[in-house]
Interface confidence: low
């Protein structure tokens, strides 16, 4: 129902601690460059706005749009032309240009300093200090790094985080307890980041109807029991969540998650036997748990897809008189039986599905036409197939780090255009995938590999974006999401590629490198392998890996000499004339 | 293990009715589609008609109107009225590879069942 | 009509001759909708090769089907003493009611 004053409703709804979190994510996903502090007094002033407003909502401005009211504040800040530029223009538009204007100004790859932990002593003084503090930290630094990170989740990780930090300073070695700990909710973060840039991405480019698609696969694979219709209430449900949440509109997204989480918990019956233990936890725990939560078994007497969608002879009636119910149907009862393929799969396969129809549901005898496509699904299906085992393979033979060179190998030579720093994360998130994803269970991997690799793509995709330099990458790129991931897979060494000159001072290394953490050392060395393959494009596996072996070792004599400083100008340009023997 | 069964074969006298039955078993009737096709002896192998997962019957064109395939949860039938003495065969059912419904690929089969028709 | 016409009617070759086999349509079968069978005396046929050249699991590689539109070869690069048999070939149209068998091919031991 429509509420009087929409900042207090949402203040009521949420609480003033998810409030507070919500609007500081809000402000640092738009002006990624101001301090905490600058944030912080922004946050605390729209919180006494919204008492004002709960206390009365017929008070000054209390009737204004969300919108509204945070552009105005954001459009205050000083220095906003010196600080941000362009973004300033955003502020001389009405709503809702403005908002949008601000969502376009979103910086995917801010320049700001990567996100350094602070020793655990430190930690767990600040945290003890003010705890509420230590954590509006972390959610703004997080959020400015991140300005698509799905607002209701981050509350969750900033939740976990506490729980770390309550937990492990009152530990006697604090550091051994935090590290391992902090370290897993970073990564689940980072994945949890990537993944839902790529819902927003879906969304911008192509659409409700996209991820509503996306949706669908996803809950009939988790939800076979529930009937299309419970499917179908989840999907626009989630939808709406997601659209407000990559609109920035993040007290709308958080609250209608809650609802959403909710209904789903309210209605066990008619979704799904696994519920439960979720529906127990308090609210951040439960819509997480319920948002990764196992698939429920699939029903015993499903009968064989072909019955409704190939064998009826109304198939192109139904087709015609409701595309988007038939294909939604299609994707549903696909999917259900298919909790062993990646979502990406599942809408190729409908896509194939709708093509194949729309062809044949134009000619004389549809039947026979469309008589096959299960079939012609066969190779669409065998294709991630192979990708994941010859992968997988890869990786149980190499392991992460040496797994992740090859990738970077491979997508050198099929765009030695992009940006080296790119490259070498793109496949070090890449290679991640064999650790997160081949040591799981046969028919767990596909999904895990297909759908990791798109949302790691994505992110590829949008950097290019900002300075395309590969007609390959622009290529994958422009194309439909779910295909992009088979595009990259299928390019080949760019032929159009003048290698680049070789520079002695790209692999002159010094002492300094011997101090690195492992991390950083790994870069490193990868990003001197990136620009070998730059350098000899055509380079075999075998020369690339004499000469990293080489330079491995070189490392490692020149970091356990006595005089490290000495070891690296001598043997340094040694290893470079070795390297340009071993690639000539 | 997956079997197709046929029965119901005999001598009938032109004219006469017949209706052969394909008991399937290993599988369920209603994820495939099943044929039935027959051989004169010493002849050509000649398609009569399938029975879709989902129900819907197709007839060769010869054989519309005399022909008649139906199903029940384990069997196929094959109806045979106005039988002729060119109709004296050997009759299989068969089913179609699984994503094939509307080609003739045919992976399983009966061991067949004599139909005779004689005065 | 539907034509499907096999040659020869029949061959007569060795253990290890190299055997080859064609069907030919009129009209095109559609889609490459084209199989073979192999039929023993007494006993029900078995689909070797469909989609013209797909080979059917457990089908040794010694069979082979190449060809589209209206004709169509099997061949058996190295005939074995358990391939004396009678081949078939059945065609897909683009009604499923013209679904049509060649009359065979005998392969008998020389």
């Known amino acids: 129902e429509a509420h009087k004053s929409e900042i207090a409703h949402r203040y009521n709804d949420l609480g003033e601690q998810h409030f507070k979190g919500l609007v500081l994510i809000a402000f640092s996903q738009y002006l990624q460059k101001c301090s905490y502090d600058e944030h912080a007094k922004l946050v605390q002033e729209v919180t006494d706005f919204a008492k004002t407003c709960v206390a009365d909502e017929s008070a000054a401005n209390c009737d204004k749009s969300l919108h509204t009211l945070f552009g105005d504040k954001l459009c205050a800040i000083p220095n906003l032309r010196e600080n941000y530029g362009e973004l300033a223009d955003c502020c001389t538009k009405q709503e809702p240009e403005r908002n949008e204007c601000f969502l376009q100004h979103k910086d995917d790859n801010p320049s700001l300093p990567p996100f350094e932990r602070p020793e655990a002593e430190a930690m767990c003084t600040s945290f003890k200090e003010n705890p509420t503090t230590f954590m509006g930290h972390y959610l703004h630094e997080v959020a400015r790094r991140h300005p698509y990170f799905y607002a209701p989740e981050l509350l969750y990780y900033a939740e976990q985080y506490n729980e770390i930090l309550t937990q492990c300073c009152a530990e006697a070695d604090k550091e051994s307890c935090l590290t391992p700990k902090l370290d897993g909710v970073k990564e689940k973060a980072l994945v949890s980041s990537v993944r839902q840039r790529m819902k927003c991405s879906s969304m911008q480019k192509f659409g409700e109807r996209a991820f509503k698609a996306w949706a669908v696969a996803r809950l009939s694979q988790t939800f076979p029991n529930a009937d299309f219709a419970e499917i179908t209430k989840l999907a626009t449900d989630l939808t709406k969540v997601n659209k407000e949440c990559c609109h920035g509109d993040l007290l709308e997204c958080a609250d209608d998650r809650a609802e959403l989480a909710k209904y789903m918990c309210e209605n066990q019956a008619t979704i799904s036997s696994k519920l439960q233990t979720c529906c127990d936890k308090p609210l951040l725990k439960k819509a997480h748990c319920l948002s990764e939560v196992e698939h429920d078994t699939m029903p015993a007497d499903l009968p064989a897809i072909a019955a409704d969608f190939v064998e009826d002879q109304e198939v192109c009636k139904n087709y015609a008189e409701a595309k988007d119910v038939f294909l939604g149907t299609f994707l549903y009862e696909y999917s259900r039986r298919h909790p062993d393929y990646s979502v990406s799969l599942l809408l190729r396969l409908a896509k194939k599905y709708e093509a194949t129809l729309e062809k044949c549901c134009a000619e004389a005898n549809p039947p026979a036409c469309y008589g096959t496509v299960l079939a012609e699904f066969q190779p669409l299906v065998e294709e991630p197939k192979n990708l994941v085992k010859t992968n997988c393979d890869l990786y149980e033979k190499l392991g992460e780090y040496g797994f992740q060179n090859a990738i970077l190998v491979r997508y050198t030579q099929k765009a030695p255009q992009v940006s080296t720093p790119t490259l070498v994360e793109a496949a070090r998130n890449l290679g991640r995938v064999g650790t997160k994803c081949c040591t799981l269970p046969e028919d767990q991997r596909l999904p895990c590999v297909e759908d990791y690799l798109s949302a790691i793509l994505n992110r590829v995709c949008l950097l290019h974006e900002k300075t395309p330099v590969s007609e390959h990458v622009t290529k994958c790129c422009s194309g439909s999401l779910v295909e992009r991931r088979p595009c990259f897979s299928a390019l080949t060494v760019d032929e159009t590629y003048v290698p680049k000159e070789f520079k002695a001072e790209t692999f002159t290394f010094h002492s300094d490198i011997c101090t690195l953490p492992e991390k950083e050392k790994q870069i490193k060395k990868q990003t001197a392998l990136a620009e070998l393959v730059k350098h000899k494009p055509k380079a075999t596996a075998e020369q690339l890996k004499t000469v990293m072996d080489d330079f491995a070792q070189f490392l490692d004599t020149c970091c356990k000499a006595a005089d490290k400083d000495t070891c690296f100008s001598t043997e340094g340009p040694n290893l470079v004339t070795r390297c340009k023997d071993a690639l000539a | 293990e997956v079997q197709l069964l046929e029965s119901g074969g005999g001598l009938v006298q032109p004219g006469g009715s017949l209706r052969l039955s394909c008991a399937v078993s290993?599988?369920?009737?209603?994820?495939?589609?099943i044929n039935w096709v027959r051989q004169a002896p010493g002849k050509c192998l000649e398609w009569i008609g399938i029975?879709?997962?989902?129900?819907t019957t197709f007839y060769a064109t010869w054989a519309k109107g005399r022909f008649t395939i139906s199903r029940d949860s384990t069997t196929v039938y094959l109806q045979m009225n106005s039988l002729r003495a060119e109709d004296t065969a050997v009759y299989y059912c068969?089913?179609?590879?699984?994503?094939?419904?509307?080609?003739?690929?045919?992976?399983?089969w009966g061991q067949g069942t004599l139909v005779t028709v004689s005065s | 009509d539907i034509v499907m016409t096999q040659s020869p009617s029949s061959v007569s070759a060795s253990v290890g001759d190299r055997v080859t086999i064609t069907c030919q349509s009129s009209?095109?079968?559609?889609?490459?909708?084209l199989s073979w069978y192999q039929q023993k005396p007494g006993k029900a046929p078995k689909l070797l090769i469909y989609?013209?050249?797909k080979l059917t699991s457990g089908v040794p590689s010694r069979f082979k089907g190449s060809g589209s539109g209206t004709d169509f070869t099997l061949t058996i690069s190295s005939l074995q003493p358990e391939d004396f048999a009678t081949y078939y070939c059945?065609?897909?149209?683009?009604?499923?009611?013209?679904?049509?068998f060649g009359c065979g091919t005998k392969v008998e031991i020389k």
């Open positions: 068969a089913r179609t590879v699984p994503g094939y419904s509307t080609a003739p690929y045919f992976d399983l």
């Open positions: 290993g599988i369920d009737l209603s994820n495939y589609a």
């Open positions: 029975i879709w997962a989902s129900g």
């Open positions: 009209p095109s079968v559609w889609s490459n909708f």
């Open positions: 989609e013209a050249s």
């Open positions: 059945g065609g897909g149209y683009s009604s499923i009611s013209d679904t049509t």
